[in-house]
Amino acid sequence: MAERAALEELVKLQGERVRGLKQQKASAELIEEEVAKLLKLKAQLGPDESKQKFVLKTPKGTRDYSPRQMAVREKVFDVIIRCFKRHGAEVIDTPVFELKETLMGKYGEDSKLIYDLKDQGGELLSLRYDLTVPFARYLAMNKLTNIKRYHIAKVYRRDNPAMTRGRYREFYQCDFDIAGNFDPMIPDAECLKIMCEILSSLQIGDFLVKVNDRRILDGMFAICGVSDSKFRTICSSVDKLDKVSWEEVKNEMVGEKGLAPEVADRIGDYVQQHGGVSLVEQLLQDPKLSQNKQALEGLGDLKLLFEYLTLFGIDDKISFDLSLARGLDYYTGVIYEAVLLQTPAQAGEEPLGVGSVAAGGRYDGLVGMFDPKGRKVPCVGLSIGVERIFSIVEQRLEALEEKIRTTETQVLVASAQKKLLEERLKLVSELWDAGIKAELLYKKNPKLLNQLQYCEEAGIPLVAIIGEQELKDGVIKLRSVTSREEVDVRREDLVEEIKRRTGQPLCIC
């Protein structure tokens, strides 16, 4: 009993601590840790039925998808998959959890966001954090040196997400990657082309793709006087420049990460620059940067990349941005990130600050990490941030009060009189067998008005009405729900007529 009282007191104290930290706007990591402690204390306390009412909800950072949301999602996926297939990609799938060892050491500072699973009989497992590391493991395991693949699946991150801005702990990623030894920058350019094609097709607003190169970053840090051990941590500070001012980034680098102020200032001179191919040319003339082998390689490749992007007709969408320093450890070359410049300004709609909607880069060393002999398979890829896109599309449709169909039913089989259930069942079965998407109401004697109303609500375009007279005449009354126009169609012609009216191919081959 004393044990329970002590635990209850600790839960109370820990709860107060968490609230205090939130009020003080303490670091996200500290709050996350203290919240995790609170949850562990509560778990030890166990349920006290007299006090605790179980709240029915999805776990933090997750959500259910309603039929309406799923309809949006499927449309978005359709655009993406069609583009991936147009570019000749195969599709793969991998397990939702991996051996913990597979994921360790691949994500740098982000490793703390990996979900570890409780021990399930000896294997230490973690939920996948992205689709790239599992892809690299797949290549190494199957000794593949050449593949162009896409993979659409859920990934998991122990983030503290702002769900209103399309950020979750469980979310979909849509990845496209090209693995293999090819001439420089051709696959990289295609990845950027794919990114632009998809974002343009989705019509979610104007966007810009920021491009940089890990080698330029590393070279720049080296000439500015950053020690090797600090490269990655300084990268993560620089990457915040799209969200906060240079002063704040500098303070973090100097105050929290121990960088000398003059080194930070030298970095600042570079990372605040962005432009096009002219900036690449300018930096190739930079007396210090051009002396650095890594940076020079990176700049040379970027120059070539811009040539290809011009040929692909997308150079106007690309900006060379020296502050882009994506937070994942595995990038080795070109890196890129697409951001929305603004969401469509619909009447009465709040502008959405959803930031990055796609990203990617070159990661030539990742497969080698899994190969016993360290054999490298060069890879480049991209990931579409579909959750953010879903949020934008959903909000836009809500603002437009647009009706979204959540089913694809083409026709409702209805009856105008009683005692025609058997006939309706026979007809709906004929339609299903012919590949028509059809429904009927699950009532013996539904009122015609109710059946028509159901079509209005569900957006079903056609009603096939059976009546006693129609049965005698061997016809079916086909009614258009929107125009209310009715025509008698011979029963043997019904399938063809429905297909004609709904634009479905006549053969389901």
Epitope: E9, L10, E33, L41
Partner: antibody, heavy 120, light 107 residues
Framework: QVQLVESGGGLVKPGGSLRLSCAAS????????MSWIRQAPGKGLEWVSY????????KYTDSVRGRFTISRDNAKNSLYLQMNSLRAEDTAVYYC?????????????WGQGTLVTVSS | DIQMTQSPSSVSASVGDRVTITCRAS??????LAWFQQKPGKAPKLLIF???NLESGVPSRFSGSGSGTDFTLTISSLQPEDFATYYC?????????FGQGTKLEIK
């Protein structure tokens, strides 16, 4: 019953390295935050570092940050402290300690300690 | 960092005496305080946690009180095995800090 047994201490020259280990038994090691606490000869106690149950979180006192690394292997029920660039002021008995109620930063169970002497 | 100051640094008392040791934090720590007992050549032993909760197996003559910045450990009737050094420790924020210790000696 809960047992924590430290090992790996000894005499080392300034600038040298040592790796301390702590073997845990008698409880579900992977459920608990663990820590290293030290006590210089004839002096008070100093909390050196801690590590969370899953190794997600680690912290170090200022005087050892960048030189010491705490780690754990839940499969082996073991806690470690890698000590590099050792200084004379690191001389102390190092205790491995288990948190109270898994996550409360109060040392409920302690090992017997292992002596680290840094001297030229 | 939060500083913990214990007083007195040493105290002489006899078996059967009532002894009070105080601990002051340099800033408020709510009830995040523990008391430990340490005997020469041994590891410390937890007595009290979150200011006033007696650790299981610890005799009831030990008690703790206080919150915020001022805390006390009281031994109601000293026993021969109680002569040792006592430390307070704050568990409010890292680095978790201990008081300098109070040595309880036989008069």
């Amino acid at each position: 019953q809960v047992q924590l047994v430290e090992s790996g201490g000894g005499l080392v020259k300034p600038g040298g390295s040592l790796r301390l280990s702590c073997a845990a038994s008698g409880f579900t090691f992977s459920d608990y935050y663990m820590s290293w606490i030290r006590q210089a000869p004839g002096k008070g106690l100093e909390w050196v570092s801690y590590i969370s149950d899953s190794s997600r979180y680690t912290k170090y006192t200022d005087s050892v940050r960048g030189r010491f690394t705490i780690s754990r292997d839940n499969a082996k029920n073991s806690l470690y402290l890698q000590m590099n660039s050792l200084r004379a002021e690191d001389t102390a008995v190092y205790y491995c300690a288990r948190y109270l109620y898994q996550v409360i930063a109060i040392a409920k169970s302690w090992g017997q300690g292992t002596l680290v002497t840094v001297s030229s | 960092d939060i500083q913990m100051t214990q007083s007195p640094s040493s105290v002489s008392a006899s078996v059967g005496d009532r002894v009070t040791i105080t601990c002051r934090a340099s800033q408020g720590i709510s009830s995040w305080l523990a008391w430990f007992q340490q005997k020469p050549g041994k590891a410390p032993k937890l007595l009290i946690f979150v200011a006033s909760n007696l650790e299981s197996g610890v005799p009831s003559r030990f008690s703790g009180s206080g919150s915020g910045t001022d805390f006390t450990l009281t031994i109601s009737s000293l026993q021969p095995e109680d002569f040792a050094t006592y430390y307070c420790q704050q568990a409010e924020s890292f680095p978790y800090t201990f008081g300098q210790g109070t040595k309880l000696e036989i008069k």
